[in-house]
C-alpha cells in the first residue's frame, strides 16, 4: 500500500490520521462513597474506581479527585449509569389541603468544569420522580451523548442524593468517556 | 498526499492505522424466544435476529447460539435495550404483617464469557423494581458502555424473566457492539 | 513513518483511511416546540436547536426542518433522550366494571426517512406505561444504537405527546448521531 492510496477520490484534505487504539478512554465503576460535606443546593459528585475490575483509564485520560481529566481536544462520547435504591417514598399518601405534594426525585448530572470558565456546565441530566407504592424500590438512570471538549476540561457525575446510590456492584453504577 | 504527512507533529509512534469501515460491528434485534428450560437461579440468555431487518453483523463479528463472538482484541462499545411488559404486579397490595413485601423486579445483564475463565463476568446490569398499580405495564431498560475485550470473548444478554420480554418489534429490544 | 507501515501483517486490504475529526457529527438540544398540526395516528416530530449552547452539527451533517440529514453512507451511532413531565395519570383509579383501564404511556421513536422508500423506518423505540399516583411526574427515556445509513437518509425524533416534553433545559432532552 502506498500513502497516497489513503486519499479519497475527492481529494479532501484530512487532519492527521491516528490509530484508534491510542485515543483517550476511560470506564470508571462505582465505589462506596465516603461521607463528605456538600453545599445544600449543590448536588454532590461521586467518586469512582479507575483501575480495579472492569475500570480503566488509558492514553492520558486520567482520573483524579472525582474528575475525569480530558487530555486533548475533540469530540467525546460520555456516558453514565447510576442505579438508585431506597425505601418507599410516601409522596402519594401525604397530601396538603387535598392537593398532591411535590414528588421525591432522583437526578444524575454529568457536569463539565473548565478552569477558565467560572460556572460548571451541565452536559447531561437524567431526572425522575419517585413516587413508589408499597415497598422498597430500585432503578437506574442512564445517560450518554457526544460533546466537543477542550484539553483540560474536567468531567464529573453529580447526584441528587448520594445516600440513594447503589454502590454494591461495578456493573450497576458507572461512568465513562472516549474520544471519537 | 505522502505517507509521512499522516505523522503528527510530535512524532508519537502510533499503532498501525486501519479503516473504520472494516471494524467488527453488530446490531442484533429481538426475536420471539423459543420455549426452553432454564435453571431457577440463573437468568436465561436471549437469542437474536442477526441478518433480517435492521440487524447485521460485519467484519468477522459473528453471532451464534445466543452469543456475539469477539473477533479481535480492543475496546468495544456494547449496548442493549430490553423492553419488558407485564400484567399488574400485585406487590403493592400484598403485605405481610403490615410491611411491604419484596418487590417484583426486571433485570437485564450483559455478560462476558471467556473460555479460559470459569465464571462469566457481568459487564452491565440494569435492574428496576416493578410495583405497578392497576393496569398492564411496559418499560425499557437501556444499557451501554465501553469495555476492553479479548479475541474469543463472547457476549450475551440475560434477563430476569424471559416471559416478560417484548419481542414484537425490532426497535424495542436490541443488542449491539462495535470496536472503537 | 512510511505509508506501507500502515498495512497490518495479515495484508488485509482496507478501505481508504480518513481522520476521525472530519466525520459527520451532530448533537441537537431541545427547544420549545411550536404548535403544529399532525395526523391523529402519527407521532409528531420534535424540532431542535443545532448551533447554540451545547448543540452543534459538523462535517456536512446538517439539520433542517426537524431532520438530521445524513451526508455519507456508513455506520452511525444514533441516540436521543426525551424527558417527559406531566400531571398525575389517574389510570390506576378509574376502573370500568372492576377492571383496570388501558394505561397512559409515553413513547419516543427515532425514525429514518429514505426518499426512495415510501414508509419511514422506526430504528429505535422507547415506550413506557405511566400510571403515577398522587403527584406530578417526570422521567426520561433514553435510546441509542448503531445503524447502517445511506447518504441522503433523514433522521427525526417522534414522541407520543409533544405537550409532555420537557423543553426547559438542553441537558434533559437531546438528539445526536455520529459516523463511526
Amino acid at each position: 500500500l502506498k500513502g497516497q492510496e489513503f486519499a479519497p477520490s475527492h481529494q479532501q484534505v484530512y487532519a492527521p490520521l491516528r490509530a484508534d487504539g491510542d485515543k483517550p478512554r476511560a470506564h470508571l465503576t462505582v465505589v462506596r462513597q465516603t461521607p463528605t460535606q456538600h453545599f445544600k443546593n449543590q448536588f454532590p459528585a461521586l467518586h469512582w474506581e479507575h483501575e480495579l475490575g472492569l475500570a480503566f483509564t488509558k492514553n492520558r485520560m486520567n482520573y483524579t479527585n472525582k474528575f475525569l481529566l480530558i487530555p486533548e481536544s475533540g469530540d467525546y462520547f460520555i456516558y453514565s449509569q447510576v442505579t438508585f435504591r431506597g425505601m418507599t417514598s410516601e409522596c402519594s399518601e401525604i397530601r396538603q389541603a387535598g392537593r398532591p405534594n411535590k414528588p421525591d426525585s432522583i437526578t444524575v448530572v454529568i457536569t463539565k468544569v473548565t478552569d477558565s470558565y467560572p460556572e460548571p456546565t451541565q452536559l447531561l441530566m437524567g431526572t425522575k420522580s419517585v413516587c413508589e407504592v408499597g415497598s422498597n424500590w430500585f432503578q437506574p438512570i442512564y445517560l450518554g451523548a457526544m460533546f466537543s471538549l477542550q484539553e483540560g476540561d474536567k468531567l464529573m457525575v453529580n447526584v441528587s442524593d448520594i445516600s440513594l446510590v447503589d454502590y454494591t456492584k461495578e456493573d450497576k453504577t458507572f461512568f465513562g468517556a472516549f474520544l471519537l | 498526499l505522502k505517507g509521512q504527512e499522516f505523522a503528527p507533529s510530535h512524532q508519537q509512534v502510533y499503532a498501525p492505522l486501519r479503516a473504520d469501515g472494516d471494524k467488527p460491528r453488530a446490531h442484533l434485534t429481538v426475536v420471539r424466544q423459543t420455549p426452553t428450560q432454564h435453571f431457577k437461579n440463573q437468568f436465561p440468555a436471549l437469542h437474536w435476529e442477526h441478518e433480517l431487518g435492521l440487524a447485521f453483523t460485519k467484519n468477522r463479528m459473528n453471532y451464534t447460539n445466543k452469543f456475539l463472538l469477539i473477533p479481535e482484541s480492543g475496546d468495544y462499545f456494547i449496548y442493549s435495550q430490553v423492553t419488558f411488559r407485564g400484567m399488574t404486579s400485585e406487590c403493592s397490595e400484598i403485605r405481610q404483617a403490615g410491611r411491604p413485601n419484596k418487590p417484583d423486579s426486571i433485570t437485564v445483564v450483559i455478560t462476558k464469557v471467556t473460555d479460559s475463565y470459569p465464571e462469566p463476568t457481568q459487564l452491565l446490569m440494569g435492574t428496576k423494581s416493578v410495583c405497578e398499580v392497576g393496569s398492564n405495564w411496559f418499560q425499557p431498560i437501556y444499557l451501554g458502555a465501553m469495555f476492553s475485550l479479548q479475541e474469543g470473548d463472547k457476549l450475551m444478554v440475560n434477563v430476569s424473566d424471559i416471559s416478560l420480554v417484548d419481542y414484537t418489534k425490532e426497535d424495542k429490544t436490541f443488542f449491539g457492539a462495535f470496536l472503537l | 513513518l512510511k505509508g506501507q507501515e500502515f498495512a497490518p501483517s495479515h495484508q488485509q486490504v482496507y478501505a481508504p483511511l480518513r481522520a476521525d475529526g472530519d466525520k459527520p457529527r451532530a448533537h441537537l438540544t431541545v427547544v420549545r416546540q411550536t404548535p403544529t398540526q399532525h395526523f391523529k395516528n402519527q407521532f409528531p416530530a420534535l424540532h431542535w436547536e443545532h448551533e447554540l449552547g451545547l448543540a452543534f452539527t459538523k462535517n456536512r451533517m446538517n439539520y433542517t426542518n426537524k431532520f438530521l440529514l445524513i451526508p455519507e453512507s456508513g455506520d452511525y451511532f444514533i441516540y436521543s433522550q426525551v424527558t417527559f413531565r406531566g400531571m398525575t395519570s389517574e389510570c390506576s383509579e378509574i376502573r370500568q366494571a372492576g377492571r383496570p383501564n388501558k394505561p397512559d404511556s409515553i413513547t419516543v421513536v427515532i425514525t429514518k426517512v429514505t426518499d426512495s422508500y415510501p414508509e419511514p423506518t422506526q430504528l429505535l423505540m422507547g415506550t413506557k406505561s405511566v400510571c403515577e399516583v398522587g403527584s406530578n411526574w417526570f422521567q426520561p427515556i433514553y435510546l441509542g444504537a448503531m445503524f447502517s445509513l445511506q447518504e441522503g437518509d433523514k433522521l427525526m425524533v417522534n414522541v407520543s405527546d409533544i405537550s409532555l416534553v420537557d423543553y426547559t433545559k438542553e441537558d434533559k432532552t437531546f438528539f445526536g448521531a455520529f459516523l463511526l
Epitope: - | R32, M87, S163 | -
Partner: antibody, heavy 119, light 111 residues
C-alpha cells in the same frame, strides 16, 4: 376479512408423517405468528408450537420437539405443520391460529383438520 | 410443569350469571401476557372471548367479562343464553414461553 383455511382430513398409518396446510388471506401473512393447536376426540386443547412466517423461526412445545416441523411458504401465504412418527394417540383435530402480537392470544382460527392414525 | 386448573363443568339457567375459574399452579403464569379465554361451541373451532385477563375483542358481547385475583383468573357470563352452551378454555404462557391451556369447562344452560 382474515381467514385461515386448512387442508382436508387425512388418514395415516402409525409411523407415517402428515403435513397439514393453513392458507392465510385478508392480512399480511408475514406480520403475524401462526400457532398450531390440536384437540384429541373428546379432549381439551393442546398447544404444539408457533411459527414466524417472516423469519421462519419456530418454537415447539417440549412434548413435540423432534417430531414436529413448522414451515411457511410466503409466496402462497401458507403455513405448514408436519408431524412425523405418528401413533394412534396423535389422532386429533389440528388447528392453525393467528396470534395477537401484543398478548400472544389466538385471535383467528382455521376450521381444523382431522388426522386419523390407524393401522 | 405448570398447570392451569378449571372446573370440569358449570351450569346455570337462562338469564343467570356463571363464573368459571382458572387457577395456576405457578406464580409466573400470565406474568407477561395475562390469561386468555376461548369459547368452543359444539363442532366448531375455538373463538377468542377475552385476552389479557380483561379485554374483549370486537364482536364479543359485553355479557362476557374477565377478571384476575392473585394466581387465578375468572370468566364471568351474565344473562346466560342457550347459545352459550359449549366448552370454555383458559390459556396462558409459562416461564419457558410454552402456551398452556386449562383442561376446559363444559357450560350447560339448564332448561
Amino acid at each position: 376479512q382474515v381467514q385461515l383455511v386448512q387442508s382436508g382430513a387425512e388418514v395415516k398409518k402409525p409411523g407415517a408423517s402428515v403435513k397439514v396446510s393453513c392458507k392465510a388471506s385478508g392480512y399480511t401473512f408475514t406480520s403475524y405468528d401462526i400457532n398450531w393447536v390440536r384437540q384429541a376426540p373428546g379432549q381439551g386443547l393442546e398447544w404444539m408450537g408457533w411459527l414466524n412466517p417472516n423469519s421462519g423461526n419456530t418454537g415447539y412445545a417440549q412434548k413435540f420437539q423432534g417430531r414436529v416441523t413448522m414451515t411457511a411458504d410466503r409466496s402462497t401465504s401458507t403455513a405448514y405443520m408436519e408431524l412425523s412418527s405418528l401413533r394412534s394417540e396423535d389422532t386429533a383435530v389440528y388447528y392453525c391460529a393467528r396470534e395477537v402480537p401484543e398478548t400472544a392470544a389466538f385471535e383467528y382460527w382455521g376450521q381444523g383438520t382431522l388426522v386419523t392414525v390407524s393401522s | 410443569q405448570s398447570v392451569l386448573t378449571q372446573p370440569p363443568s358449570v351450569s346455570g339457567a337462562p338469564g343467570q350469571r356463571v363464573t368459571i375459574s382458572c387457577t395456576s399452579s405457578s406464580s409466573d403464569i400470565g406474568a407477561g401476557s395475562g390469561v386468555h379465554w376461548y369459547q368452543q361451541l359444539p363442532g366448531t373451532a375455538p373463538k377468542l372471548l377475552i385476552e389479557g385477563y380483561y379485554n374483549r375483542p370486537s364482536g364479543v358481547p359485553d355479557r362476557f367479562s374477565g377478571s384476575k385475583s392473585g394466581t387465578s383468573a375468572s370468566l364471568t357470563i351474565t344473562g346466560l343464553l342457550p347459545e352459550d352452551e359449549g366448552d370454555y378454555y383458559c390459556q396462558s404462557y409459562d416461564g419457558t414461553l410454552s402456551a398452556l391451556f386449562g383442561g376446559g369447562t363444559k357450560l350447560t344452560v339448564l332448561g
